[in-house]
């Protein structure tokens, strides 16, 4: 049809942290690169009705919905969402085309359904439906990548089961230990499924999809390096595929290398080997020992043996369910306002784990580093010296697990003061807890030095906010003060603070505050 | 059959350097860790270290990094454990002994006896 | 590193006697302890390894057994050629670890 003008749908990802609800708009705010949502015509439907791509969005995502119409003359228009009409205000873009637009921000369920857009041009009307959908993010996983053998060919293939279709990526290095951090030069990156070059120091597979990024190491036992400082376990589940690399290096090809489980050989297809020279000529050999799906019994020692190499071996172990294993029991600390301080939880699990630290209801991001041991470790530094409760917790597939920690900062008290018709309050904060005491000041005792004992109540923990416990001091007025000035201070063994209070009409009179270390 | 034949005793002031080295034989050489243990007079046994005939690789106990080297010759089938910087407390019989597997000393040198005195 | 504490420290016995050694550790170490025999002056002599497994050419009357931290040393019925100082050394973790011995003297 040659009436027909041509449109264009868009639809554009923002970057933004805005709250307010989906709005009409001429003007979108800056965004990512459009992405062509094709908007083709609609056949049997009466009129002119062009559909564009179903649009998939996350929770609290915002996107603009666009329409470019490249047709002479003015454009009128109008957006019906869920039978309500949406004001809509066409301009005019550098190419002259009509740029017609509709923002949504921060997307929610009452946001999701079709949108039709109504354009009116001086040749002709047509309609324009988008359909907007909340991305089911029940549906995603992302599961740890697993290894396989291509088949007739010396190679692995990594493979990770997870929705939407991960990106899998090799992760390469061929120095020792700390140089083999994920950022390191030392690490070479290959985006692929299949690799060949199996010979290289540390190997590891990850994939990454919208959840984040799993990863999984092939476990390697190098008979060149003498032993780790525990024996290497290894932990897998029922059905898991198994996979350990043993590697050699020696000055010619005169050696060979076996696995054996429990002192016996490993049945032939439950293992495979290959070599290469490297480059100053030494022959490296390495042979791979795999069970398609470990059951019970593949539990034990793996012992890799070379002709001219000592032996090396890996405890195996097959768990029926994955596992968190650390103490849970709660822990307080007390430091000083300056001191450095880390709080930190060893533990050993399997699968890994996925964990987050706490500190008045807000989350903080968990890193874990293994221990040569076999054992984990998370540490916490950026408490910024807040005393209260830090809540570490894991979970993986199999188990959860929650330590609560006190920090309990050392410092002198700081006292706050507050009176009303019939008594004095004195809250303070300190650690430890302080002790109070009340004087009274008059003629007799310029000073304040008279000690009342009377009327006095003490709460040592009276209020709990996060964890961090306040102490209050409460005076109940009698004739005997009325009118006069009373200091209450609290002391521990960073010092002393007080404050004077004038007790004669309600509301709060602190007029000193007096600061004795 | 398994041997490991250790050099004789030696005798020497604080702050020099000792070289121990002992001969293995009946296996073949770089099929088996070995490790050094030593024994002060009257007292238990403690680990030194370990070597990796085959790579030459080492990994020694915290007490002694930095003091203690070990090395290897494999035309001649023999490990060396090198102390310097020695102190009276030095003074102990140092074993070199066979790793089966996983750490399990299955065959031990007789012994050398180094003894630290001004 | 892991702690091996042996019991008793001394011990008298005639030949013939049941003798039972044992051994401790600071953390559990699986099955990874070994049990030696040292006479004075010699080097010390494997009979146990893996908690319960019997060198070869050690005699039967030698056993072992346990597993995680608490190890015991069993000799059934005590000869003349027993009389000597036990170690137990646990191999879990590099560095390997040895108890501070029992002296089993004739009563």
């Known amino acids: 049809n040659q009436d027909l003008p041509v449109i264009k749908c868009v639809l554009i990802n923002h970057k933004n942290n805005d709250s307010s609800v989906g709005k009409s708009s001429s003007y979108p705010m800056v965004s990512e690169s459009p992405e062509d949502l094709g908007c083709a015509l609609r056949p049997q439907s009466s009129g002119t009705v062009y559909e564009a791509a179903a649009v998939e969005v996350d929770v609290s995502a915002s996107i603009t919905l666009q329409v470019l119409v490249d047709a002479p003359g003015n454009i009128s228009c109008l957006w019906v969402f869920k039978h309500s009409s949406l004001n809509c205000q066409p301009h005019f873009d550098l190419q002259n085309r009509g740029v017609v637009s509709m923002v949504i921000l921060k997307m929610t369920e009452t946001q999701a359904g079709e949108y039709l857009l109504f354009i009116q041009s001086e040749a002709t009307n047509y309609t324009i439906l988008f359909t907007v959908s909340i991305r089911n993010t029940l549906l995603y996983t992302l599961r740890r990548p697993y290894f396989r053998k291509m088949e007739n060919q010396d190679a692995l293939v990594c493979i990770s089961e997870s929705v939407p279709e991960p990106i899998v990526e090799w992760v390469l290095c061929d120095s020792q230990g700390e140089s083999c951090k994920e950022e390191s030069p030392a690490v070479v990156k290959k985006e692929e499924k299949v690799l060949h070059e199996l010979f290289g120091t540390d190997i590891r597979c990850c994939a990454r999809n919208e959840l984040g990024r799993e990863c999984t190491r092939l476990f390697t036992i190098d008979l060149n390096q003498t032993p780790q400082t525990t024996l290497p376990q290894l932990f897998l589940k029922v059905g898991e595929p198994l996979w350990i690399r043993c590697k050699a290096v020696h000055v010619n090809h005169g050696f060979g290398l076996t696995w054996e489980l429990e002192n016996k050989a490993l049945e032939e297809g439950n293992y495979f080997e290959m070599s290469t020279y490297s480059t100053n000529r030494t022959m490296i050999r390495i042979l791979f020992a795999f069970v398609s799906s470990v059951a019970r019994n593949d539990t034990g020692y793996y012992t890799c043996s070379s002709s001219k190499h000592p032996s090396q071996s890996a405890l195996v172990t097959i768990v029926e369910k994955g596992f968190i294993n650390a103490t849970n029991s709660s822990e307080d600390y007390e430091i000083d306002q300056y001191e450095e301080f880390c709080f930190s939880v060893r533990f050993k699990a399997y699968p890994q784990i996925r964990c987050t630290w706490t500190f008045s209801r807000k989350s903080f991001p968990c890193e874990q580093k293994g221990l040569d041991n076999g054992y984990s470790i998370s540490k916490f530094c950026n408490h910024k010296h807040q005393p209260g409760e830090y809540i570490f917790h894991a979970e993986n597939d199999d188990a959860q697990f929650t330590k609560m920690f006190t920090l309990n900062i050392r410092r002198k008290p700081q006292v706050l003061a507050e009176a009303s018709a019939s008594q004095a309050s004195c809250f303070s904060d300190g650690y430890p807890l302080p002790s109070w005491t009340w004087k009274k000041c008059s003629d007799k005792s310029p000073n304040c030095t008279e000690e009342i004992t009377e009327g006095v109540w003490n709460r040592k923990a009276n209020r709990k906010v996060f964890g961090q416990w306040v102490s209050s001091s409460t005076l109940n007025m009698s004739e005997a003060i009325k009118g006069f000035l009373v200091k209450c201070c609290a002391y521990n063994s960073l010092g002393t603070s007080c404050e004077t209070i004038l007790l004669n009409s309600p509301g709060p009179f602190p007029f000193i505050q007096d600061n004795i270390s | 059959q398994v041997q490991l034949v250790q050099s004789g005793a030696e005798v020497k002031k604080p702050g020099a350097s000792v070289k121990v080295s002992c001969k293995a034989s009946?296996?073949?050489?770089?099929?088996?860790?070995v490790h050094w243990v030593r024994q002060a007079p009257g007292q238990g046994l403690e680990w030194v270290g370990i070597?990796?005939?085959?790579?030459?690789?080492?990994s020694y106990a915290q007490k002694f990094q930095g003091r203690v080297t070990m090395t290897r010759d494999t035309s001649t089938s023999t490990v060396y454990m090198e102390l310097s910087s020695l102190r009276s407390e030095d003074t102990a019989v140092y074993y070199c002994?066979?790793?089966?597997?996983?750490?399990?000393?299955?065959?031990w040198g007789q012994g050398t006896l180094v003894t630290v005195s001004s | 590193d892991i702690q091996m504490t042996q019991s008793p420290s001394s011990l008298s016995a005639s030949v013939g006697d049941r003798v039972t050694i044992t051994c401790r550790a600071s953390?559990?170490?699986?099955?990874?302890l070994a049990w030696y025999q040292q006479k004075p002056g010699k080097a010390p002599k494997l009979l146990i390894y893996?908690?319960?497994s019997l060198q070869s050419g050690v005699p039967s009357r030698f056993s072992g057994s346990g597993s995680g931290t608490d190890f015991t040393l069993t000799i059934s019925s005590l000869q003349p050629e027993d009389f000597a100082t036990y170690y137990c050394?646990?191999?879990?973790?590099?560095?390997?670890?040895f108890g501070q011995g029992t002296k089993l003297e004739i009563k």
């Open positions: 002994a066979r790793d089966r597997l996983r750490s399990r000393f299955d065959y």
């Open positions: 893996a908690a319960s």
């Open positions: 050394q646990q191999s879990y973790t590099i560095p390997p670890t």
């Open positions: 953390q559990s170490i699986s099955s990874s």
């Open positions: 070597i990796n005939p085959s790579s030459g690789s080492a």
């Open positions: 009946g296996y073949t050489f770089t099929r088996h860790y």
